[in-house]
Interface confidence: medium
């Protein structure tokens, strides 16, 4: 499969475990992948009694679950780790939980930050 309509070159980056993993905490990530594979952005988080704990954001490699998704929407009902992916630069800035089995849609807005570019 070739690159999608919304070609992904950069994603919002975040790592809650940045100190232990010796990475930046947040910024922008340039996505790199194989020539014939699509690139995506993702966001992952936990929901502990209504409190959202962001886990990671960044680039995600070729995944049919992300194809042609312009918004980052997690659809699993009650997972251990919520996960969404999408196509298009910085599409993982906002992320949403909309379970396929029905239930309220919850959208998470990021706090304003000064991004750092990761290469």
């Amino acid at each position: 499969s070739g690159r999608g309509e919304a070609e992904t070159r950069e994603c919002i980056y975040y790592n809650a475990n940045w100190e232990l993993e010796r990475t930046n905490q947040s910024g922008l990530e340039r996505c790199e992948g194989e020539q014939d594979k699509r690139l995506h952005c993702y966001a992952s988080w936990r929901n502990s009694s209504g409190t959202i704990e962001l886990v990671k954001k960044g680039c995600w490699l070729d995944d049919f679950n992300c194809y042609d998704r312009q918004e980052c929407v997690a659809t699993e009902e009650n997972p251990q780790v919520y996960f969404c992916c999408c196509e298009g630069n910085f599409c993982n800035e906002r992320f949403t939980h909309l379970p396929e089995a029905g239930g309220p849609e919850v959208t998470y807005e990021p706090p304003p930050t000064a991004p750092t570019l990761l290469t």
Partner: antibody, heavy 118, light 107 residues
């Protein structure tokens, strides 16, 4: 209780075909990607194929591409693996497994044995 | 494809020992790694997901760490039921490749 139960394994000659089934219960089957993993006798685990919850997306390992077809019937809560042009090296225990990709496979079946031999 | 290399391939240990298994990816996979335990004749069981998160119901003596290319599974105090083969698996890029396995045997 979340459960997966494989069936359809057996002895088949090289070049032959076999269809494996995996019956799921205890969870909303259509909401999850499903995977086949195999294990040759005395060897490690080998990822074979995955299908999206809707059935619209699939991936295959290079070793089975063009010979194996993964499919699902969400109305029957059943996952399938159609195996054609079987080779001796396809001899293995075949497991079906549930799980979102990022977490890994959190539920596995007990496995069904496929033997390809003349 | 991303290659996963596990070491050692086998380790002999006694009950109560601390056991460490390592897994190396051929390219960076962030923390998208799972660890499984498999006993003879049984299906694998998920122990750790996202490199360091303990799967529900798994004893706390199991822990995972690492990010990027280097990962570790640690059993802090080996119990009789822990003698098994352990596999890592990267879930960052299809195909979702496994490591070759590490057999933990009784010394």
């Amino acid at each position: 209780e979340v459960q997966l139960l494989e069936s359809g394994g057996g002895l088949v000659q090289p070049g032959g075909s076999l269809r494996l089934s995996c019956a799921a219960s205890g969870f909303t089957f259509g909401s999850y990607g499903m995977t086949w993993v195999r294990q040759a006798p005395g060897k490690g685990l080998e990822w074979v194929s995955v299908i999206s919850g809707s059935g619209g997306g699939t991936y295959y390992a290079d070793s089975v591409k063009g010979r194996f077809t993964i499919s699902r019937d969400n109305s029957k809560n059943t996952l399938y693996l159609q195996m054609n042009s079987l080779r001796a090296e396809d001899t293995a225990v075949y497991y079906c497994a549930k799980g979102p990709r990022i977490v890994g496979m959190d539920v596995w079946g007990q496995g069904t044995t496929v033997t390809v031999s003349s | 494809d991303i290659q996963m290399t596990q070491s050692p391939s086998s380790v002999s240990a006694s009950v109560g020992d601390r056991v460490t298994i390592t897994c190396r990816a051929s390219q960076g996979i962030s923390s998208w790694l799972a660890w499984y335990q498999q006993k003879p004749g049984k299906a694998p069981k998920l122990l750790i997901y996202a490199a360091s998160s303990l799967q529900s119901g798994v004893p706390s003596r199991f822990s995972g760490s690492g990010s990027g290319t280097d990962f570790t599974l640690t059993i802090s105090s080996l119990q009789p039921e822990d003698f098994a083969t352990y596999y890592c698996q990267q879930v960052f890029s299809y195909p979702l490749t496994f490591g070759g396995g590490t057999k933990v045997e009784i010394k």
